[in-house]
Interface confidence: medium
C-alpha cells in the first residue's frame, strides 16, 4: 500500500542466471546418401549462450548446414533467384537476400533449375522450415536459478532474492513455494498461459518480472520479491513478419587443409529478466 510519509526510491539491481538440464536429441542424419537416425546429448554448453544484460537464451530447435566451405556454388533458388543465362547474373553484385557475391555466371543448381553462381560459404544455406516438433522440446524440464541482488543507495539497504534458509532443491511454485528462485522453464510458460512445445519450434521471448515492493521501516519491515511471467514477442507467428526468435552461429574446423564450418540456425527462447520496484522508508 502507498505510504505517503515514506521517502521512496527505485531499485538498483544486478542479475545472474544459471541454467541446468540435459536434453537427448534424435534427428535424421544423412551420410554418403544414406539417412539414419542420429542420437546426441546436449548439455548447458551446447544450448545456452551468454547474452548481455539481464537475459539468457535456451536453444530449443535448430537447422544445420554442414560442411560449408568458402568457394563458388549456385545460390539457393529462392523466389526470383533463378536464371537462364549469364546476362541475368551481375559480376560483383551482392543481393541482400543472397548468401554471397555473384561471379557473373549462371550455373545449374540441380537437374531442372539454374541460379547465379556466388562466391560464398558453400553449399549455400537452404531455406528449410524449423523441425516440428522441436528437437530440444525436453528443454521444458530445464531449470534456471536466478540470483538477484538489489540495492537502495539512498536508504543504504542491500538484499537478495536468495535467502540463507533456502533449499537448493526447491522449485518455484506460485502457491507452494513463491520465494524459491529456481524455475522450471515449462512452469514459466504455464504461468504465462503459453504452450512451451509450440513456442519451442520457432522460438520466442519470455519476460520474467521481479517486483520488489520494499517497506524498509524497522517496525514493519518487508522486502521480498514477487515473480510474474509474460510473453514479450508477437505470438501471432502467422501475422508477424519474422516469426519467433532465431540467430545463426557457426562451428569451424579444418579438413584437407581447408577451413570448413557447420552453420547452425538456432531457434529458442530468450528470457528477459525485468527487475523493478521501490524501497520506502520514513
Amino acid at each position: 500500500s502507498d505510504k505517503l510519509y515514506q521517502r521512496k526510491e527505485p531499485v538498483i539491481s544486478s542479475v545472474h542466471t544459471k541454467v541446468k538440464g540435459i536434453a537427448e536429441v534424435t534427428e535424421n542424419v544423412t551420410e554418403g546418401g544414406v539417412t539414419k537416425l542420429g542420437h546426441s546429448i546436449f548439455d548447458t554448453a551446447d544450448y545456452t549462450f551468454p547474452l548481455q544484460g539481464n537475459s539468457f537464451f535456451v536453444m530449443t530447435n535448430y537447422v544445420k548446414s554442414e560442411g560449408q566451405v568458402q568457394t563458388l556454388c549456385p545460390e539457393y533458388p529462392r523466389r526470383g533467384a533463378q536464371c537462364s543465362s549469364d546476362r541475368r547474373c551481375k559480376k560483383g553484385w551482392m543481393d541482400p537476400q543472397s548468401k554471397g557475391i555473384q561471379t557473373g555466371r549462371c550455373v545449374p543448381y540441380d537437374k531442372t533449375r539454374k541460379t547465379c553462381e556466388v562466391s560464398a560459404w558453400c553449399p549455400t544455406e537452404e531455406e528449410k522450415e524449423a523441425p516440428r516438433p522441436a528437437l530440444l522440446r525436453s528443454a521444458e524440464n530445464f531449470t534456471v536459478l536466478i540470483k538477484n541482488n538489489i540495492h537502495f543507495p539512498g536508504h543504504n539497504y542491500t538484499t537478495r532474492n536468495i535467502l540463507p534458509t533456502m533449499n537448493g532443491s526447491c522449485t518455484f511454485h506460485k502457491t507452494w513455494d513463491p520465494q524459491c528462485s529456481i524455475f522450471r522453464l515449462g512452469d514459466i510458460f504455464q504461468e504465462a498461459g503459453e504452450n512451451f512445445t509450440e513456442v519451442a519450434v520457432q522460438g520466442g521471448i519470455m519476460g520474467i518480472e521481479i517486483y520488489w515492493d520494499c517497506n524498509l521501516d524497522s517496525w514493519s519491515h518487508h522486502c521480498r520479491p514477487r515473480y510474474s511471467f509474460r510473453r514479450l514477442d508477437d505470438k501471432n507467428t502467422d501475422e508477424s513478419f519474422v516469426p519467433g526468435y532465431n540467430f545463426r552461429y557457426a562451428k569451424y574446423y579444418k579438413e584437407n587443409n581447408v577451413e570448413k564450418r557447420t552453420l547452425i540456425k538456432a531457434f529458442g527462447i530468450r528470457f528477459d529478466i525485468l527487475v523493478f520496484g521501490t524501497g520506502g522508508k520514513f
Epitope: 560442411g67 560449408q68 566451405v69 568458402q70 568457394t71 563458388l72 556454388c73 559480376k91 560483383g92 561471379t103 557473373g104 555466371r105 553462381e117 562466391s119 558453400c122 553449399p123 579438413e255 584437407n256 581447408v258 570448413k260
Partner: nanobody
C-alpha cells in the same frame, strides 16, 4: 603468374591403370574448382571429373565407377586415378582450375595437357 603442370600420362594396355597429377603454382586468392577435361582427335573438349573446394565430386557418365578424382589443398594438387582403361579413353587430358579473385570474379586456368593412349 599461375601455372598448371600435368604429369602421369603415357601408353597403357586396355584394363590397365594410370594416375594423373596436376600441380598448380603461382599467386592466387584461393583455388575453387579443380578438374580434368579431355580432348580426343577430331572431337570437342569434354568434362572428365571435377572436385570442389568442399570435396564434392562430379564425373562424366562414361568414367563413373572407373575414375576417381581427388585434391590435396596443402600441395595445390589435383589427381585423377584411372582404372579399367578403355581405348575410348585415349585423349589429351587437360587440368583446369577456377580461381575467384576479389573484385574481378572467376578466372579459368588450363594446363598444357598430357597424352593418355590406351592400346594393345
Amino acid at each position: 603468374e599461375v601455372q598448371l603442370v600435368e604429369s602421369g600420362g603415357g601408353l597403357v594396355q586396355p584394363g590397365g591403370s594410370l594416375r594423373l597429377s596436376c600441380v598448380v603454382s603461382g599467386s592466387m586468392y584461393r583455388i575453387d574448382n579443380m578438374g580434368w577435361y579431355r580432348q580426343a582427335p577430331g572431337k570437342q573438349r569434354e568434362l572428365v571429373a571435377t572436385v570442389t573446394r568442399g570435396d564434392i565430386t562430379n564425373y562424366a557418365d562414361s568414367v563413373k565407377g572407373r575414375f576417381t578424382i581427388g585434391r590435396d589443398n596443402a600441395k595445390n594438387t589435383v589427381y585423377l586415378q584411372m582404372n579399367s582403361l578403355k581405348p575410348a579413353d585415349t585423349a589429351v587430358y587437360y587440368c583446369n582450375i577456377d580461381s575467384y579473385i576479389i573484385g574481378a570474379g572467376v578466372r579459368d586456368y588450363w594446363g598444357r595437357g598430357t597424352q593418355v593412349t590406351v592400346s594393345s
